[in-house]
Amino acid sequence: MAVTACQGLGFVVSLIGIAGIIAATCMDQWSTQDLYNNPVTAVFNYQGLWRSCVRESSGFTECRGYFTLLGLPAMLQAVRALMIVGIVLGAIGLLVSIFALKCIRIGSMEDSAKANMTLTSGIMFIVSGLCAIAGVSVFANMLVTNFWMSTANMYTGMGGMVQTVQTRYTFGAALFVGWVAGGLTLIGGVMMCIACRGLAPEETNYKAVSYHASGHSVAYKPGGFKASTGFGSNTKNKKIYDGGARTEDEVQSYPSKHDYV
């Protein structure tokens, strides 16, 4: 029950996070004009990853897209790439996690397969969240650098007479949406990975206890396997039913997935 809840919550948190990453990527307010001490401005500039906008105090807003690809700063291109990679990974992760949900029954899918899918989606969410956080942080760093550069030459004197006020930009709402969304996706991914461990629990390996009967030697082995006789009627330890238990060989093939989450 706790595993299902953890998995379900992880899915929902990641879903909200990815929706937030998509929203942040599409938002125009990645950087907004710094208003200094003046909260009311006649012309307000703000920029996104795809276009820049100007809102006038008349109520008119005009946005124009960045119709060049080569002319854009490399950092902006990198941020775009990180956000898109985050969205793509997140979307794939969501798709995978839907099929991995314990509450959803698809054919005769084994719990081990669901555990694998849960882990895969969890890792995808973690990487997606990290991509978003990295993208937003790179943009924020770019803003901080430009802010102090423009502050240094805030007023560039032209002939000592005319002043040209340089527009400074500060953090826009999209950055905060991106950070929060990235964090949520990351948390959702971690929850999925935790749920994966519960879906495929580690076996407690007890030593096989042999009981010597007068006629036959019967070894009882726990873990959902039928006892095998000493005469080799079930020497391969074939599964009689699937209750999420595995042979010792199977357990050994999984350590990296469960021990290094």
């Epitope: 009311v40 401005t41 500039n45 006038e56 008349s58 008119f60 005009e62 002043q163 040209t164 527009t167």
Partner: antibody
């Protein structure tokens, strides 16, 4: 079609108060008051966002003048306190348009501050 | 505050003349966000309210005759009347529309020669 009609002007004594009104019809996102002293140039007084109520004033009028609006009556106001002789002017209300230009103006209302 | 200086303060011209009025601002009115200059031109006749002619330094308001044109960027702007008509004799004002407080030039009176 936008129509702006000012009212409330008249003779007032120095130190007195007056409230100007501007009846607005048509779409107005933000409005302004601009004045013109006799034989002088145009002087911007104040701006208001008709939806949010956000406002700003020219330095000479901060503290003395208050711009406001009444949504229900679709009316713009300019409350003028501590009036001085130099406040004598024709007061216009004007709509702010694209490019922060003033595209529609009222006919103006004359305010005379004299003892 | 941005100061607006118009020149000349008055001028005499004849019908059909080409008239140029200049306006200088103490700060650049060019907005980097949309590469537009926030300068506006108005015409005012005696006893009447001002009338909008040009916004964004060079965009003609609909209904305004094409003989009016605006140009300039940064701090220097020009209003040109290509062929003066009898109805054009009036006072012309430039306005800073870039930042509050909005400020007007002192005006240029165009009189009949």
């Amino acid at each position: 079609e936008v129509q702006l009609v000012e009212s409330g002007g008249g003779l007032v004594q120095p130190g007195g108060s007056l409230r100007l009104s501007c009846a607005v019809s048509g779409y107005t996102f933000s409005m302004n008051w601009v004045r013109q002293a006799p034989g002088k140039g145009l002087e911007w007084v104040a701006w208001i966002n008709m939806y949010t109520g956000e406002r700003t004033y020219a330095d000479d009028f901060k503290g003395r003048f208050t711009i406001s609006r009444d949504d229900s009556k679709n009316t713009l106001y300019l409350q003028m306190n501590s009036l001085r002789a130099e406040d004598t002017a024709v007061y216009y209300c004007a709509r702010l348009y694209r490019g922060n230009s003033l595209d529609y103006w009222g006919q103006g209302t004359l305010v005379t501050v004299s003892s | 505050d941005i100061q607006m200086t118009q020149s000349p303060s008055s001028l005499s011209a004849s019908v059909g003349d080409r008239v140029t009025i200049t306006c200088k601002s103490s700060q650049s009115l060019l907005n980097s966000g949309n590469i537009k200059s926030y300068l506006t031109w108005y015409q005012q006749k005696p006893g009447k309210a001002p009338k909008l002619l040009i916004y964004w330094a060079s965009t003609l308001r609909s209904g305004v005759p094409s003989r009016f044109s605006g140009s300039g960027s940064g701090t220097d702007y020009t209003l040109t009347i290509s062929s003066l008509q009898p109805e054009d004799f009036a006072t012309y004002y430039c306005q800073n529309a870039y930042s509050f407080p909005f400020t007007f030039g002192q005006g240029t009176k165009v009189e009949i020669k």
